[in-house]
Every structure is written in structure tokens, then in C-alpha cells.
């Protein structure tokens, strides 16, 4: 029944988000008759590919085809057969592949080449696989949430209940947390963006936007944890690391070779007198928070103000949508409500981290231990990043909205990417180069 011709005149598009920890495929749909050349796209399907991110296939590229099969077959089922040939497929790889490219451009190219060959075997209109820049990732995330919130257009939309804005046109900032990088993107208030690398100018729906964006490579939650472990093992007196970011009673053996595998830990690398060490959780939020803060260099700033590591950050302005891992982690911790104050979040994190590992395992029996064990670190990291990294305060905390989906579409960079690549962001093209896509022929 899925493949019956649809009475409505619609088009489809597919975007694969090849992240550092996993790959997700998104199917988008929009009416063929576009309102004023501005299509209205929404997500009809998300398929999470089983397995790790594509960068992990560097030694087994022959397995990439099988890895992508299930989700590509799902796309075949969801999209009517008559539309297959005209449905574009794009794959964007993010920070996991940026890190692999830093290690070896040749290996990164080999992975992308096999991905491209695999995706070309399907009956869709494959448009290419590429590593998107951190700047693009931030910009497209910002476009996605503001598009879905109706911040760009005052038109009534074609599906269900959708934005017809009467005022309220202030855009939301975007906070995106992945496994290997994190992005902050917003429109500053009458503030010069002092660093050209962080400035984007574009015109959307007849309005000019001067947008600040930065992507912090190695500051996604997984790579931040590797960084913290590499930093802390430097001062450990033996092969036992008593770690405040894990629950009391938690134990895990880590290979030193795995620790130093990522470029993110290079700055902490040293010759250790052991090949393995054991993490022993002590579950102390305050100490965990202090350890995390050591990852942020706030002693140097060549601008009027900085986030950390000498990166310019204008004063925060307006509301922010925090999505991806910001949302997943805070949802697990039951801390996504707008009225949960920053003080209350901190209090709850203190209690959560102090809970014994055996108790935690019993309370969350359905959750994989690998993920479960890291929520104390991840929650503490999110607080540290937002408060000390980006300078949110107890007062401005209430302007952070933890968002999973808006109008049924995932908050994230893929929808913005789709909007741009299908030319459904108005004919007046964005002025900034990262959004121009000259890569595609």
C-alpha cells in the first residue's frame, strides 16, 4: 500500500546525517507547487542506522554497503516508486569525519568514496556525500529551528497546524551538541562580529540576517569525555583513575591506545607506565564540574569577549533552542522543562551523580550500560559548557529551550541543509559562501 500513487502532488528528499557516533537517515516531503518559491518541507521518517559512525569503518570499508542497507530500503518503502528517480539523496558527514580527515585525508576520502558508491546503487537521485564544515552545521541548525518555528515567513503553511506569525519574529539561537563537536549560532544584538570566521550574512525570505556561529571541534560530549580522561590520567599515581564523573561503584577498563586514538587527546598525550587503566567512579558533581572546566582555556582572549580557547563570542541574545544531545541527555535526566531553574538542574545533577551504580542500573534496567554510565558526565558537561563555556547565567538559563522535534521534524542541521539544496530557501541566495554548495554539480 505504501507505493500507491499519492493523490497529492508532492516531492521527497533524503538527507543522511553521518555523525561521529551513528548515522541517521531523514526523509522529507513537500508540495510540488511551492508557495512563492518557498517550499514547505517536513520530516516524514527518521531511520537510525544500526552501528557506529562511518568514521569507524576506516579499517572495514567493505562493510559500509551492508551498514546502510536497512535504512535505504526503508526509504524505498516510504517513498512511492514513481518518485524514486527524482528524489535527491544527500549525505553530510560531521565532526567524526572532520577528525578522521585531520588524521588522514586519504582514509577519509576512501570512506566517503565507498559511501558514495553504496548510495549510488539505489534508484534515487544521489547528489553526493561530503564532510560539511562546522560553520555549515551551525548555520543549517539555526535555519532548521527558525524555519520550523515560523520565524522567517508569515505565510500559512500547507500541513496541519503551523506558524502564522503575527509578531514574535525574533529568531531563536541554536545550540547543537554532538558526539565530537558542539555548535553555537545566533543573531547578536547590534554587535559587530569581531572575528570574520564566525560571521555569516544571508538573506532569507526578504530579510537580512547577520549571524554569529562557531563549531568547537573536540567538544562534543564523547570527545570531551576522552579529553577529560586523557587530562586526568596524566596525574594519576597508578593505573586506577578515581573519577567523579561516574557513579560510585562503577568500574571500567580503558585501553591507553583507545584514549590516544583521537586527535582530541593529542594535547594531553604522554608515555604512561601501563597499557590499561581502570576508571573507578566516585560520583561527585562538584569535582566532576571542576575537572571539566580544565578543558576550557579561559585565560586568553584576543577579542572584547570570548567563549573559551580564544574564540570570540558576542553577548548572548534572545531565546535558544538546544537540541541533539543537549535534548537527549536532558530528557533522560528529566530536566527539559522550561521552569526547571539552573539551580534546580545543578541540585538534581548532584543527587544523580551521587547515586550508586548498582542502584542506577536497577532504576534504568532498560537502558544500555554504555549510555547509562555516561549520563552523569554528560549532564555535568552540558551545565559546564552552557554556563562557563557560553556564559549563560541563572537568569538567562530560562531562555534555553531543550527541543527534540518541532512540528514533527527533528531539530538539527539536516532540514536546513535540505531546504538550501532543494532551493527552497528563497531565490535571493544567501551571501555567505559556506551555504552556496558549489561542491555539487
Amino acid at each position: 500500500t505504501q507505493n500507491k500513487a499519492l493523490p497529492e502532488n508532492v516531492k521527497y528528499g533524503i538527507v543522511l546525517d553521518a555523525g561521529s557516533s551513528h548515522t541517521s537517515l531523514y526523509i522529507y516531503k513537500w508540495p510540488a507547487e511551492k508557495e512563492n518559491d518557498t517550499g514547505v518541507v517536513h520530516q516524514v521518517e527518521e531511520c537510525r542506522v544500526k552501528g557506529p559512525g562511518i568514521s569507524k569503518f576506516v579499517q572495514k570499508v567493505n562493510e559500509i554497503g551492508i551498514y546502510l542497507t536497512d535504512c535505504m530500503e526503508r526509504a524505498r518503502e516510504v517513498i512511492p516508486r514513481s518518485q524514486h528517480q527524482e528524489t535527491p539523496v544527500y549525505l553530510g558527514a560531521t565532526a567524526g569525519m572532520r577528525l578522521l580527515r585531520m588524521e588522514s585525508e586519504e582514509l577519509a576520502d576512501r570512506v566517503l568514496d565507498v559511501v558514495e558508491r553504496s548510495l549510488s546503487n539505489y534508484p534515487f537521485d544521489f547528489q553526493g556525500a561530503r564532510i560539511i564544515t562546522g560553520q555549515e552545521e551551525g548555520a543549517y541548525g539555526w535555519i532548521t529551528i527558525n524555519y520550523l518555528l515560523g520565524k522567517f515567513s508569515q505565510k500559512t503553511r500547507w500541513f496541519s497546524i503551523v506558524p502564522y506569525e503575527t509578531n514574535n519574529q525574533e529568531t531563536f539561537g541554536a545550540l547543537d551538541l554532538g558526539g565530537a563537536s558542539t555548535q553555537v549560532t545566533f543573531v547578536p544584538q547590534n554587535q559587530t562580529i569581531e572575528s570574520p570566521d564566525n560571521a555569516l550574512q544571508f538573506r532569507l525570505y526578504g530579510k537580512d540576517y547577520n549571524v554569529y556561529t562557531h563549531s568547537f571541534l573536540c567538544y562534543g560530549k564523547d570527545q570531551a569525555l576522552w579529553q577529560k580522561l586523557a587530562k586526568d590520567i596524566q596525574v594519576a599515581s597508578n593505573e586506577i583513575l578515581r573519577d567523579p564523573c561516574f557513579h560510585p561503584g562503577y568500574k571500567k577498563v580503558v585501553n591507553v591506545s583507545d584514549l590516544y586514538k583521537t586527535p582530541c587527546t593529542k594535547r594531553f598525550e604522554m608515555t604512561l607506565p601501563f597499557q590499561q587503566f581502570e576508571i573507578q567512579g566516585i560520583g561527585n558533581y562538584q569535582q566532576c564540574h571542576q575537572s571539566i572546566l580544565e578543558l576550557f582555556n579561559t585565560s586568553y582572549c584576543p577579542y572584547s569577549q570570548c567563549a573559551f580557547n580564544g574564540i570570540f563570542l558576542p553577548p548572548l541574545q534572545g531565546d535558544f533552542g538546544a537540541f541533539s544531545a543537549f535534548y537527549f541527555v536532558m530528557k533522560f535526566l528529566n530536566l527539559t522543562s522550561e521552569k526547571v531553574s539552573q539551580e534546580k538542574v545543578t541540585e538534581m545533577m548532584k543527587k544523580f551523580c551521587a547515586q550508586p551504580w548498582e542502584e542506577i542500573k536497577t532504576s534504568y534496567a532498560g537502558v544500555k550500560e554504555k549510555y547509562l554510565s555516561e549520563y552523569c558526565f554528560s549532564g555535568t558537561y552540558i551545565l559546564s559548557l552552557l554556563l562557563q563555556g557560553y556564559h549563560f547565567t541563572a537568569d538567562s538559563w530560562e531562555h534555553i529551550h531543550f527541543i527534540g522535534k518541532i512540528q514533527g521534524s527533528d531539530a538539527g542541521w539536516t532540514l536546513g541543509y535540505m531546504l538550501n539544496l532543494t532551493n527552497m530557501i528563497p531565490a535571493e541566495q544567501p551571501l555567505s559562501t559556506p551555504l552556496s554548495h558549489s561542491t555539487y554539480v
Epitope: Q43, V44, E45, E46, L149, S160, I161, E165, T166, N167, N168, D319, K331, S337, E338, K339, V340, E398, H399, H401, I403, G404, K405, I406, Q407, G408, S409
Partner: antibody, heavy 118, light 108 residues
């Protein structure tokens, strides 16, 4: 069209349980939270709780803890609310409604009238 | 929990008149989390305005919303006979989600 279908009425005995259903159509069921509301005769609306069909995560109004249990069946795009240990106080119309960011309810079911009577 | 107080409980108006319903919150709410519904007797509630000022699909433009902090309002620019109903405000800012007690609009 986006629709939430609910049975019209249920009559149940005091002390018994009832499982109310809400069948979704016209949209991707797992992409929106499902909420449940109660409206007693001639009264206003009370929020009971919500469930995310993608991962079965729930939030409930403490007032209904132990009274209402929310579940979903992804394969049939149906949300359920089980009400237990019913008393005459539970006689009301129960609505399901789809939730979106900002926690507003954009699509409502037709409502199921529950009468608790012996 | 956040208590929403709507006033008045009942109001009587004539077609063509401008009407304003108010909703007062017991603590401050971010405007993204305040919404309005219309319910006619024997029917399900219907979303009118979401996130303070956004008109839901299919809702006539005579309806508008505004407000911030603890004070919000719904306005009908020119009342029509079909607007006879009960109007509820609702907050999604914190758990539990709560509704105001409603304002019943009657026709003169």
C-alpha cells in the same frame, strides 16, 4: 487529514479498570508526544500526562499517579490510557491530544465519555 | 504548579464588538509556552493561538494573542455569533501542564 479517533463512550463498574484508546492517522505517530486530558461534566480541562511514542518516555501529573498509566502501540499508531480503581469521581470525558514544542495541543481526539456506575 | 486565572468567568457580548479575555499566571511564563483554545459545547477543544501570538491553521484573523511574563490576553477583533464558546488558556512551561478555568462567551 490528521486525526485522533477515540471510542465514544465506556461504562464501567466502580473499582474496575478501563483502557481507553486513541488511534492516530495522517501523520508520523512517533514524531509527536501524545497527551491525555480529563474534563468532568461542566468543568474545565485537566492535564493527565504525556508519552513520547518514539521511546515510551512519560511525564505525569502527580494528581493522577497510580490512577492513569500511559502506553503506546507503535505498530497500530495507537495510544492507550489505563485508568484503575475507578470511582464516580473518575466519570468524565477523556481527550487525547497531540503535543508540539511549547507543549501546546494542536490536534484533539473526539473524546471518550467514561461513566463509572454500578 | 503554575495556576492560570482567567477573567471574567462569563462574559456577554454582541456581534461586532471587540472582546478581550485575560489570563494571569501565578509565576512568570516564557511566551513560547502560553496557548489558547476554544471549546464549543459537546465538542473537543480547538487550538486557536499558540506561543502567545501565533494563529493556528484555519483560525480566522479576527483572533489575536499577546502578553508576556504573568499577563496574557486573547482578543477577538470583531465578535461573530459563531464565536460563542468557552475559551481556555494553557501553559506548557512546567509540569504539570495546566489550563485556566475558562471564560464562557455568551451572545447578547
Amino acid at each position: 487529514p490528521v486525526q485522533l479517533q477515540q471510542p465514544g463512550a465506556e461504562v464501567v463498574m466502580p473499582g474496575a479498570s478501563v483502557k481507553l484508546s486513541c488511534k492516530a492517522s495522517g501523520y508520523t505517530f512517533t514524531s509527536f508526544w501524545m497527551n491525555w486530558m480529563r474534563q468532568r461534566p461542566g468543568q474545565g480541562l485537566e492535564w493527565i500526562g504525556e508519552i513520547d511514542p518514539s521511546d515510551f518516555y512519560t511525564n505525569s501529573n502527580q494528581r493522577f499517579k497510580g490512577k492513569a498509566t500511559l502506553t503506546v502501540d507503535k505498530s497500530s499508531s495507537t495510544a492507550y490510557m489505563q485508568l484503575s480503581s475507578l470511582t464516580s469521581e473518575d466519570s468524565a470525558v477523556y481527550f487525547c491530544a497531540r503535543g508540539d514544542f511549547g507543549w501546546y495541543f494542536d490536534v484533539w481526539g473526539t473524546g471518550t465519555s467514561v461513566t463509572v456506575s454500578s | 504548579e503554575i495556576v492560570l486565572t482567567q477573567s471574567p468567568t462569563t462574559m456577554t457580548s454582541s456581534p461586532g464588538e471587540k472582546i478581550t479575555f485575560t489570563c494571569s499566571a501565578s509565576s512568570s511564563i516564557n511566551s513560547n509556552y502560553l496557548h489558547w483554545y476554544q471549546q464549543k459545547p459537546g465538542f473537543s477543544p480547538k487550538l486557536l493561538i499558540y506561543r502567545t501570538s501565533n494563529l493556528a491553521s484555519g483560525v480566522p484573523t479576527r483572533f489575536s494573542g499577546s502578553g508576556s511574563g504573568t499577563s496574557y490576553s486573547l482578543t477577538i477583533g470583531t465578535m461573530e455569533a459563531e464565536d460563542v464558546a468557552t475559551y481556555y488558556c494553557q501553559q506548557g512551561s512546567s509540569l504539570p501542564r495546566t489550563f485556566g478555568g475558562g471564560t464562557k462567551l455568551e451572545i447578547k
